[in-house]
C-alpha cells in the first residue's frame, strides 16, 4: 500500500536504488566475484536471421520490412547479401559453435524465408530445409536450439496489406505460423522465444523511425503495435501451452529489453520515482503485462491514457503468466539512442547486476535467461577486441555476482553475437561478434576474436577462477 | 521555443458555433496531444478534452460530448477547437494546452482566446 | 468524476513569508497531481507535475508534497512576481479535473 502511494507502481524495485544498506538488495563492498556459476548452467550464443544469414532474395525468400527499409531508409547500405552468409555458409557457423563449446545457440528463423507472403500456406522447401539442417546439426551437437519466431524482419507483404504490427489481424497471422513452426522443428526444439525486444519494435519502428517500418512521432500507433504483440505472443503462449507442450515439452517465452539507469541523486525520492518512471516505460510496458498483473503498469495507464490501448478483463487473465521463464535483453539497442521519454533526466548505466535485481523484486523472483547481452566494437576492429572482453568480463561478474550474493534465479547467459553482421540503423559500422567475418570476402571465414577466446574458456571453467 | 498562439476574442450569439485556432510552433507539432481548457469568469478551470494531432484522434469531457469537435490542419500545424449550441454559460476564456506524455501535464500553454455568448 | 478542493480560496502575506496551500482529491489519486500558476491576461504555467517535480526553469522556492488524498503546495519565500492564482490538477482518471483555485497576493 505504502509504496503504490509513494511511487504510484505496483511492485518493490525503487529499493535498488536506495543507498540504505539494509534496505537496497544490492551489496557493492564485491566488486569483483571469483567464482563459477551454478552447474549446469546454460551458456550460449545467439544470431538474428536478417543480421547474418544473407540471401535476402535468393531460393523463394520474400522480402522483409528490414530488406525494404534498407533500400529505402538507410544510406551506403546496398542490402544485408553482403553480411555473414550464414544460410550459404551453415558449416562455417556450426564450426564456429564447436569452438566456444556452447550449450545453446540461440537463433531466429525468418519469416519471409519460410512463408515468402506471410500467410502460412505451403512453406517455402529451400527455407524449410535450411532451419531443418541446422536444427539436425545442433542436435547432434549436442547443442540445445533456443529458437526465436520473430526478430524485425516481417514479410513486407503483411506491412503493405495490412499495415503490419497496427493492425490486429497480424495476432491470428502470426499464430498460425507459430503453430506451423512448432509441428516442424518442436520435436527439436525446447526453447521458444516468440518475440525479440518488442520495445524496439515499436518504438523504433513506429516512434522514432530508426527502425523498419520507418514511421516516425505516432504514438498511438507506437502502443498500438506494442498492444499487438503483447496479444499475438500470449496467443501463442496459450497455443503452445495447450497443444504442443504436452508432447514437446518444451518452454516459451518473449524476450524484453531494457536499459538501466541510475538517480542524480541518491537520496532524492522524486528522482528515484523517475528511475522507477524510467524502467516501467521501457521494460514495465511488456513485463508487466506477462510477468505481472496482466495490465499495463499504473503510470503508463495514467499518463498515456490518449493513446494507451486498454485490456479488458479477459484480456489482463489471458495475457497474465504466459512467460515459462523471463528471457532479458541487455546490450547497446536499448542504450543508443536511448529514449529521451525514458531516461527522466537521470543518469543511464551499465549495471546489468542491477537491473536483474529489478526483475527479482518487481516480478517475484522469476527464473531468468539473458538472451541477450554484449556490447560493440568499431567496425575497424578486427579480431583484437579488448573492449568486448573488457565489457564482458564486467558483465559476466554481475551476473555472477546476482546468482551468487544476491540469490538471483539466472540458469543461462546468450553472448551477442556469434557473427559480425548487419546491424540494424548502425548497419555495418559497428561489430558485435564474436567471430570475425570480413563482409568484402567471397567465404566469409568466421576467424574467431579474442573475445571468442575468452568466452571459450570462461565456459571451460563455469566462470572465473582464481 | 514551444509556442501556442491562439485566435482573438470573438462575441457570438446564443445558438451560434465558435471555433478557435491554435498555432503551435518550436516542436513537432504531431507529436503531442492539444488538449483544450476553460476558465468561465470567475470560475476554476474546467478540462474539455484532447485530440491527437497525428491521427486526429479525439477524446471529450462527458459536459461537452456532443457540442465540442476538436481538429486539426498538420499542413500549418494549427489545432482547432469548435463549439456549437452556444449559450451565456459557455462565456470563458479557451485555452489550448500542449500534453506532455512523460509528465501527465500540460507543459505550454496559449494566451487563451475570450469566447462572449451574448445576445 | 474526481473532485479536487483547495484551501486557502485566498490568501494575502508578505514578502518573504511562506505561503502553503492544500489540495484535497475526493479520492485516492496516488501521485497523479500537477500545480500550476495563473496570472490575468497571460498563459498559464505549469510549475510542479507528479506532486513533487519541479518543472524546468522554475525557481527552486516553489515545492510540492504529499501522496493519496492529501497534498500541499509551498512557496518558501513569497516574491511580488508570485501574485496569482494557482491550481492543482488530477490526472488519475478522465475527467481531468482541476481544484478550485487560490489566490495569493502581497498584503
Known amino acids: 500500500i505504502l509504496l503504490r502511494a509513494v511511487t504510484g507502481f505496483s511492485g518493490d524495485g525503487r529499493a535498488i536504488w536506495s543507498k540504505n544498506p539494509n534496505f537496497t538488495p544490492v551489496n557493492e563492498s564485491q566488486l569483483f566475484l571469483y567464482d563459477t556459476f551454478p552447474k549446469n548452467f546454460f551458456w550460449g550464443i545467439g544470431t538474428g536471421a536478417l543480421q547474418v544469414e544473407g540471401s535476402w532474395k535468393k531460393d523463394g525468400k520474400g522480402p522483409s520490412i528490414w530488406d525494404h527499409f534498407i533500400h529505402t531508409h538507410l544510406k551506403n547500405v546496398s542490402s544485408t547479401n553482403g553480411s555473414s552468409d550464414s544460410y550459404i555458409f551453415l558449416e562455417k557457423d556450426l564450426s564456429a559453435l564447436d569452438f566456444i563449446g556452447v550449450s545453446f545457440y540461440q537463433f531466429s528463423i525468418s519469416w519471409p524465408r519460410l512463408f515468402p507472403d506471410g500467410i502460412v500456406t505451403v512453406a517455402n522447401a529451400k527455407g524449410l530445409q535450411y532451419y531443418s539442417t541446422l536444427l539436425d546439426a545442433l542436435v547432434l551437437r549436442n547443442i540445445e536450439p533456443i529458437v526465436t519466431l520473430y526478430h524485425w524482419d516481417l514479410p513486407l507483404a503483411l506491412q503493405e496489406k495490412y499495415g503490419g504490427w497496427k493492425n490486429d489481424t497480424i495476432i491470428d497471422i502470426f499464430n498460425d505460423y507459430a503453430t506451423y513452426c512448432f509441428q516442424m522443428f518442436g520435436d527439436r526444439v525446447k526453447y521458444w522465444i516468440t518475440i525479440h525486444n518488442p520495445y524496439l519494435v515499436a518504438w523504433h519502428g513506429y516512434g522514432t523511425g530508426m527502425h523498419a517500418p520507418g514511421e516516425k512521432g505516432n504514438l498511438a500507433a507506437v502502443y498500438t503495435v506494442g498492444h499487438n504483440l503483447i496479444k499475438a505472443h500470449s496467443k501463442v503462449w496459450h497455443n503452445y501451452n495447450t497443444h504442443f507442450r504436452p508432447h514437446q515439452k518444451g518452454w516459451l517465452s518473449i524476450t524484453l529489453g531494457s536499459h538501466w539507469i541510475e538517480p542524480n541523486r541518491s537520496e532524492n525520492t522524486m528522482d528515484i520515482f523517475k528511475c522507477q518512471q524510467s524502467m516501467v516505460s521501457v521494460l514495465g510496458w511488456f513485463a508487466n503485462p506477462i510477468h505481472g498483473d496482466g495490465d499495463y503498469p499504473e503510470g503508463m495507464r495514467k499518463k498515456l491514457f490518449s493513446v494507451l490501448p486498454i485490456f479488458s478483463e479477459a484480456e489482463k487473465h489471458e495475457m497474465r503468466g504466459t512467460a515459462d521463464f523471463f528471457a532479458f535483453s541487455f546490450g547497446p539497442n536499448n542504450f543508443k539512442p536511448l529514449n529521451t521519454m525514458a531516461k527522466m533526466g537521470q543518469n543511464v548505466s551499465l549495471n546489468l547486476r542491477e537491473a536483474l535485481n529489478w526483475i527479482k523484486l518487481e516480478y517475484n523472483n522469476p527464473r531468468i535467461l539473458i538472451a541477450e547481452n554484449g556490447w560493440f566494437t568499431d567496425s575497424r576492429v578486427k579480431t583484437e577486441d579488448t573492449t568486448a572482453i573488457y565489457m564482458m568480463k564486467n558483465f559476466l561478474s554481475q551476473v555472477l555476482q546476482a546468482i551468487r550474493l544476491d540469490e538471483i534465479r539466472v540458469f543461462g547467459y546468450t553472448a551477442w553475437s556469434l557473427l559480425d553482421g548487419f546491424e540494424w540503423q548502425d548497419a555495418y559500422t559497428i561489430r558485435r561478434g564474436l567471430f570475425y567475418v570480413d563482409f568484402n570476402s567471397k567465404q566469409k571465414e568466421r576467424k574467431p576474436k579474442s573475445s571468442a577466446h575468452y568466452y571459450k574458456q570462461i565456459i571451460r571453467e563455469n566462470g572465473f577462477s582464481l | 521555443q514551444v509556442q501556442l498562439v491562439q485566435s482573438g476574442a470573438e462575441v457570438k450569439k446564443p445558438g451560434a458555433s465558435v471555433k478557435v485556432s491554435c498555432k503551435a510552433s518550436?516542436?513537432?507539432?504531431?507529436?503531442?496531444?492539444i488538449n483544450w481548457v476553460r476558465q468561465a469568469t470567475g470560475q476554476g478551470l474546467e478540462w474539455m478534452g484532447w485530440?491527437?494531432?497525428?491521427?486526429?484522434?479525439?477524446g471529450y469531457a462527458q459536459k461537452f460530448q456532443g457540442r465540442v469537435t476538436m481538429t486539426r490542419d498538420t499542413s500549418i500545424n494549427t489545432a482547432y477547437m469548435e463549439l456549437s449550441s452556444l449559450r451565456s454559460e459557455d462565456t470563458a476564456v479557451y485555452y489550448c494546452?500542449?500534453?506532455?506524455?512523460?509528465?501527465?501535464?500540460?507543459?505550454?500553454w496559449g494566451q487563451g482566446t475570450m469566447v462572449t455568448v451574448s445576445s | 468524476d474526481i473532485q479536487m478542493a483547495q484551501s486557502p480560496s485566498s490568501l494575502s502575506a508578505s514578502v518573504g513569508d511562506r505561503v502553503t496551500i492544500t489540495c484535497q482529491a475526493s479520492?485516492?489519486?496516488?501521485?497523479?497531481l500537477n500545480w500550476y500558476q495563473l496570472k490575468p491576461g497571460k498563459a498559464p504555467k505549469l510549475l510542479i507535475y507528479?506532486?513533487?517535480n519541479l518543472e524546468t526553469g522554475v525557481p527552486s522556492r516553489f515545492s510540492g508534497g504529499g501522496s493519496g488524498t492529501d497534498f500541499t503546495f509551498t512557496i518558501s519565500s513569497l516574491q511580488p512576481e508570485d501574485v496569482a492564482t494557482y491550481y492543482c490538477?488530477?490526472?488519475?482518471?478522465?475527467?481531468?479535473?482541476f481544484g478550485p483555485g487560490t489566490k495569493v497576493d502581497i498584503k
Open positions: 490538477q488530477q490526472y488519475d482518471n478522465l475527467p481531468l479535473t
Open positions: 518550436g516542436y513537432t507539432f504531431t507529436s503531442y496531444d
Open positions: 494546452a500542449k500534453y506532455n506524455w512523460n509528465y501527465g501535464a500540460f507543459d505550454f
Open positions: 485530440m491527437n494531432p497525428h491521427s486526429g484522434n479525439t
Open positions: 507528479d506532486v513533487s
Open positions: 479520492q485516492d489519486i496516488s501521485i497523479y
